[in-house]
């Protein structure tokens, strides 16, 4: 009678994570009289993956009635598969005895487990930047198996060049993790702007991850400030308003200043939004021009999300100013504007 | 359900034998060993030995080698462990045990007094 | 035959303590065939890890297994009264299968 043979059919098996991995063994005679056990790995570390009469293996059930005297069939199904049951399994005769000895073994069978990446995560700079500047976009995505993957980064649809990814580790390991890091040149219109990191794996089916940055949590678009006169409102008054164009974040402190004394704070609140994201913002000052003797220098100081301040002055000659109700009032707007 | 039930308590005298038995119910009675665990009063746990009830084969401990007999009957799915020639050594709660360690009888006292 | 042994054989713990149960073989044994049990007064063992490091159906994330050769641990990362008990080592990589002596493990 020919020597039993241990066949192992599939030399590989592939299989999704979660998913169960049926792993063939047959043998070809029922002679000598001993057990099949399965092993992870060869060599003295092997790992125990099966035993027919002795532990506890959860996750493993025989397809067959493996402990049938004349079962010849010792396949196996492993569930709920993850990256750390990728490897090479044995099935390895022992002939019975005191203690039982390895008789032969399989050629093995490689299992590789598909695993999906985890939802790319991506985070941009910790402070913000202004428009003209360089940030840098980090992107994120683990846990997936086999290691080839692709990684592209887009601004509001169209596709970044300016980036450099690694993928973890180098050699083989049972998952692997990407990291992307790309640039990003800010503008002012960005406050709608998205920066998308999109991942590509065999295990998608084509339906690649997203992960996005929103760049209003990137940006700040410093204010642009103009003074001007309105017309006198009553008698000896003059309306002095500070325009605050185009900025954002919202978070601004505006403070008016007369001949260099504090005169009013005021927190920016009922802004108007821009189409592009920004916002417009507006306050007054009413100067009474018959307190003054001599000429006032007006100073609307802005403090924009924590940023050193700028200024935009505009002088008020009383001087010119008469005295009779109705006349126009002198003024002369200097256009500085001072940080 | 996986069950192994024991049967009850013994007291019996030095140098008399003892039969434990120990009835399977819920799996494959020949699927997996059956082992024999000892453990005497606040102390650790000795491992007797096991049968394979496929086809009796039988393994002991060389501590327990003349004092314990392991035996089965498939036909009631019941596993036997006769303890021989007994001492008051022999005082102690003996389990049965599946093969996959997770299934313990819920012991038999034993008590070897004249 | 491989003597398991473990230490301390008793210890008590406060609650949200971390605890350290250990196991050392006289020779190597491979980690697939390294359990642990958990005993109360009165009741049978109750599996309690295997393969070193797999907890058992029940058994609290708290607790957690790992090593290798001939030195094994047991370990709660937040001791629970509930966890008073003793636990034993066990190995069945030769025979005769063998147990630890047991760490009896109080709350204060």
């Known amino acids: 009678e020919e020597e039993l043979q241990v066949i192992q059919p599939d030399k590989s098996v592939s299989v999704a994570a979660g998913e169960s991995a049926i792993l063939h063994c047959t043998v070809t005679s029922l002679i000598p009289v001993g057990p099949i056990q399965w092993f992870r790995g060869a060599g003295p570390a092997r790992e125990l993956i099966y035993n027919q009469k002795e532990g506890h293996f959860p996750r493993v059930t025989t397809v067959s009635e493996s402990t049938k005297r004349e079962n010849m069939d010792f396949s196996i199904s492993i569930s709920n598969i993850t990256p750390a049951d990728a490897g090479t399994y044995y099935c390895v005769k022992f002939r019975k005895g005191s203690p039982d000895t390895e008789f032969k073994s399989g050629a093995g069978t490689e299992l590789s487990v598909r695993a999906k990446p985890s939802a790319p995560v991506v985070s941009g700079p910790a402070a913000r930047a202004t428009p003209q500047h360089t940030v840098s976009f980090t992107c994120e995505s683990h846990g997936f198996s086999p290691r080839d993957i692709t990684l592209k980064w887009f601004k509001n649809g169209n596709e970044l060049s300016d980036f450099q990814t690694n993928v973890d580790p180098v050699g083989e390991s049972v998952s692997y993790s990407i990291h992307s890091t790309a640039k990003v040149v800010l503008t002012r219109e960005d406050v709608h702007s998205q920066v998308i990191c999109e991942v590509a794996h065999v295990t998608l089916q084509g339906d690649p991850l997203r992960g996005t940055a929103n760049l209003s949590e990137t940006i700040r678009v410093p204010p642009t400030l103009e003074v001007t006169q309105q017309p006198v409102r009553a008698e000896n008054q003059v309306n002095v308003t500070c325009q605050v164009r185009k900025f954002y974040p919202q978070r601004l402190q505006l403070t008016w200043l007369e001949n260099g004394n504090v005169s009013r704070t005021e927190t920016a609140s009922t802004v108007t939004e821009n189409k592009d994201g920004t916002y417009n913002w507006m306050s007054w000052l009413l100067v009474n021009v018959s307190a003054h003797r001599d000429d006032v220098k007006l100073t609307c100081q802005v403090e924009h999300d924590g940023q050193p301040a700028v200024s935009k002055s505009h002088d008020l000659k009383v001087s010119a100013h008469p005295k009779e109700q109705g006349s126009n009032t002198a003024a002369e707007n200097t256009g500085s504007n001072e940080r | 359900e996986v069950q192994l039930q024991q049967s009850g308590a013994e007291l019996v005298k030095p140098g008399a034998s003892v039969k434990l038995s120990c009835t399977a119910s819920g799996f494959n009675f020949e699927d997996t060993y059956m082992h024999w665990v000892k453990q005497r009063p606040d102390q650790g746990l000795e491992w007797i030995g096991r049968i394979d009830p496929a086809d009796g084969d039988t393994k002991y401990n060389p501590k327990f080698q003349d004092k314990a007999t392991i035996t089965v009957d498939t036909s009631s799915n019941t596993a036997y462990l006769q303890l021989s020639s007994l001492t008051s050594e022999d005082t102690a709660v003996y389990y049965c045990?599946?093969?996959?360690?997770?299934?313990w009888g819920q012991g038999t006292t034993l008590t070897v007094s004249s | 035959q491989i003597v398991l042994i473990q230490s301390p054989a008793i210890m008590s713990a406060s609650p949200g303590e971390r605890v350290t149960l250990t196991c050392r073989a006289s020779s190597s044994v491979s980690s697939s065939y390294l359990y642990w049990y958990q005993q109360k007064p009165g009741s049978s063992p109750k599996l309690w890890i295997y393969s070193t490091s797999n907890l058992a159906s029940g058994v609290p994330a708290r607790f957690s297994g790992s090593g290798s050769g001939t030195s094994y641990s047991l370990t709660i990362s937040s001791m629970e009264a509930e966890d008073a008990a003793s636990y034993f080592c066990?190995?069945?990589?030769?025979?005769?299968?063998?147990f630890g002596g047991g760490t009896k493990l109080e709350i204060k």
């Open positions: 066990h190995q069945w990589y030769s025979y005769p299968r063998t």
């Open positions: 045990v599946r093969g996959n360690y997770v299934n």
